[in-house]
């Protein structure tokens, strides 16, 4: 007997989708071997329709896929737009179709129920609105119009033109009789319930001359859309509930084991603490649609999610909903990166951000998650070189190490920098990730002077002290601009106006500018790195003034403990523009900083990953 298991019989109707889950023993061989879905022909051969190696037959093109979940020993075959031709005998299996492990599945696709002749079918999701059209002849124009619901052999009056309304439909039904000449009346039912499902009868007049029309109302529990996302990645739920509820509070909730639905986020300001720092509810469009983005997906995020509208901001019977079943794939393409990065006040952090390596040319962004109201994420920096004004001189996004990872460096840290930040690109939205910056007790490892004033035409020497533990690291000085941090040439690159020399014995790396020019004014960073992986940085601002006294200026090491001017993120930042979540800017405040000097020449950034979950900043 085969150890592969699945549904022996699957039945559906034309136009629907099926999602067939097959189970296999999750041995290491089974986990990585080929998975397939094939159709058994008259000859007994089984023709592959879709496989885990990417093959999709022409018959299934654009409507089927196979997703493997190796960590729990399952794979799922999704087939959409079913037709009666899809009825037949299939196998789901592992390895080679003709031998190996498989399970027989019978798929039956039917036409749907038989209905009385001339029956109009209305298929509507629960919570939505239906308009039933009821034609009549001229002689019945002045007579009573009514809608009945057929329950077994009896007909129950639902509404009529004499103002009767069945209590089950109170406050959500109306009968409209148009002006003269239009031989049709309509019945509008709002906020449909599952119990409204069934056969209805429109009637105009009475006796043998009455007009009748059958209507079959199919109220559907919204079929959950199956969503498969990678661990650590991101999911977006797009929720379109219709204009009828455009001005009603919206929510996303998750169905729990008690079959109630716990609010994850709503437009009334409620948010589940489990999603702190990693969820945004996108502003509504005019049509009332909205979307919710969740990043940093965890295995425990799996489950059934519903979005809906109700004035209470939570699930209520008879209001429109949309449903998803979220599966989180543990065999993720998204690499592990620290979810928490620690730094000390005055110090720095270097954050590694993953992106889809197939999209190396995509624009990279970093934004600060703000939890107020529905959450927003104003952009702080992007790879094109725009940096928020408040972060001038202390924030840089660098393309290194590349190949699926970029780096963001933030220095001159204050307690107000603690919080959640998102890494994102203008490409694959599933690669959005979240990192939390924590400010802990401690002293920065790199020490530079607080302020430096250089004199035009003279020599400036700025010291940067580093501890012994960085002796094996590469030390560098760079000049910050809003496009990066241009590394300054080291002494062995030959004579230069600006060069770096390092005295290992005194654990000092000094920046020398000779002679000082107006263009030298600006922010300079001292930093350490290992290859393309950047460690800590310290920043110093150099102001340039006219010559007053002859001689060169040397900033003595004694001044190195002076604190740099702190730049604090103003909480009352003027909001320029709110953009929809589909825009990678995530409602960024687009304040553009003028270029402050040298263009970055490929200098980039990195992280010291002390563990897979936390990466150290200046707190080593």
């Amino acid at each position: 007997k085969s150890p592969v298991f699945g549904p022996q019989e699957v039945s559906s109707v034309e136009g629907n989708s099926v999602s067939i889950k097959c189970y296999y023993p999750p041995t290491s061989v089974n986990r990585h071997t080929r998975k397939y879905w094939c159709r058994k022909g008259a000859s007994g051969r089984c023709i592959t329709l879709v496989s885990s190696e990417g093959y999709v037959s022409s018959n299934y093109a654009g409507r089927a896929n196979l997703t493997n979940f190796p960590e729990n020993g399952t794979f799922v075959v999704n087939i959409a737009q079913l037709s009666r031709d899809d009825s037949g005998h299939y196998k789901c299996g592992l390895g080679i179709n003709s031998r190996g492990l498989s399970f027989d599945v019978s798929l039956e696709v039917s036409q749907g129920p038989e209905l009385p002749n001339g029956t109009e079918v209305y298929t509507v999701d629960v919570g939505r609105t239906v308009t039933i059209k009821c034609p009549f002849k001229t002689e019945n124009a002045p007579k009573t119009k009514a809608l009945y619901k057929k329950i077994g052999q009896t007909s129950v009056l639902v509404i009529d033109s004499r103002n009767y309304v069945n209590p089950n439909y109170k406050d959500r039904i109306r009968l409209r009789i148009p002006g003269t000449g239009q031989l049709i009346f309509t019945v509008v039912i709002d906020r449909l319930r599952l119990s409204d499902h069934g056969l209805y009868l429109c009637q105009a007049g009475d006796g043998s001359n009455r007009d009748e029309k059958n209507a079959d109302l199919q109220v559907l529990e919204p079929e959950p859309e199956l969503v498969y996302e990678d661990l650590r990645g991101s999911v977006t739920f797009h929720c379109a509930l219709g204009l009828e509820v455009a001005n009603v509070a919206k929510f996303l909730c998750r169905v729990n084991s008690r079959e109630t639905c716990d609010v994850v986020i709503n437009t009334l300001g409620k948010r589940d603490s489990a999603f702190e720092g990693r969820i945004l509810l996108n502003p509504q469009d005019k049509d009332g649609s909205f979307s919710v983005v969740i990043t940093g997906l965890r295995k425990e995020d799996e489950g059934r999610y519903l979005c809906g509208a109700h004035s209470d901001g939570q699930l209520q019977e008879g209001w429109p909903i949309q449903a998803w079943q979220l599966f989180v794939n543990e065999e993720s393409t998204i690499p592990r990166s620290p979810t928490v990065v620690k730094g000390v006040a005055g110090g720095s952090v270097a954050v590694l951000c993953p992106y889809n390596p197939k999209e190396s040319q995509s624009l990279k962004y970093w934004c600060l998650w703000e939890g107020a109201q529905n959450g927003r994420c104003p952009l702080l920096v992007e790879s094109q070189g725009l940096v928020q004004e408040q972060y001038e001189g202390r924030l840089s996004l660098l393309q290194e190490p590349g190949n699926g990872t970029f780096t963001v460096i933030l220095n001159q840290l204050t307690t107000q920098d603690a919080g959640f930040y998102w890494c994102l690109t203008n490409g694959d939205t599933r690669w959005r990730t979240t990192v939390e910056i924590k400010i802990i007790e401690g002293e920065p490892n790199l020490k530079v002077p607080g302020n430096v004033t250089a004199v035009l035409g003279e020599t400036l020497n700025i010291p940067c002290h580093f501890p012994c533990k960085f002796s094996s690291y590469e030390k560098y000085w760079c000049k910050w601009s809003n496009t990066g941090c241009q590394t300054l040439p080291s002494q062995d690159e030959g004579p230069s106006e600006a060069f770096v020399n390092c005295d290992e014995n005194s654990r000092l790396v000094s920046l020398t500018l000779n002679p000082v020019t107006r263009a030298d004014e600006g922010w300079y960073w001292c930093g350490v790195k290992q290859g393309h992986f950047y460690g800590e940085t310290a920043a110093v601002y150099v102001a340039v003034e006219e010559k007053k006294v002859a001689g060169s200026r040397y900033v003595s090491p004694a001044k190195a403990d002076a604190a740099p001017d702190e730049k604090v993120l103003d909480s009352g930042v003027r909001e320029i523009e709110n953009k929809a979540i589909q825009d990678p800017r995530l409602f960024a405040e687009e304040k553009v900083v003028a270029d402050t000097g040298d263009q970055a020449g490929g200098s980039r950034a990195s992280v010291d990953s002390s563990s897979s979950e936390e990466q150290g900043g200046s707190s080593k």
Epitope: P7, E9, V10, L194, L220, E223, E259, T260
Partner: nanobody, 126 residues
Framework: QVQLVESGGGLVQAGDSLRLSCAAS????????MGWFRQAPGKEREFVTT??????????YYADSVKGRFTISRDNAKNTVYLQMNSLKPDDTAVYYC?????????????????WGQGTQVTVSS
């Protein structure tokens, strides 16, 4: 909460048929699957069959030991699941439990089910 009530059990001869019913009441709206397990004296509870659904699509799972003999079906309007048992054998003697789940990862695993009925005795004599 969801309440499940089984009925239809009894004493039959080998080769006979029996039909079990399981009526669900309460908050059945988000119920995703219902099935049958059985437990013979001194043995562990074992999977028999389950039906899961999504809209108008149904998925039926059967244990190898009952394939071709037992059939599961459901009446959506009545919130009821039926188990038609044909060609019964003495080995089928057990207490049959109805179970319901809101999210089902593996229909064969009893712990995946959130709600259980009290059980109905089926005895097949030779």
């Amino acid at each position: 909460q969801v309440q499940l009530v089984e009925s239809g059990g009894g004493l039959v001869q080998a080769g006979d048929s029996l039909r079990l019913s399981c009526a669900a009441s309460g908050r059945t709206r988000t119920t995703y699957g219902m099935g049958w397990f059985r437990q013979a004296p001194g043995k562990e509870r074992e999977f028999v069959t389950t039906i899961t659904w999504s809209g108008s699509t149904n998925y039926k799972y059967y244990a190898d030991s009952v394939k071709g003999r037992f059939t599961i079906s459901r009446d959506n309007a009545k919130n009821t699941v039926y188990l038609q048992m044909n060609s019964l054998k003495p080995d089928d003697t057990a207490v049959y439990y109805c179970a319901a789940s809101t999210v089902l990862t593996d229909p064969r695993v009893p712990t995946e089910y959130d709600y259980w009925g009290q059980g109905t005795q089926v005895t097949v004599s030779s």
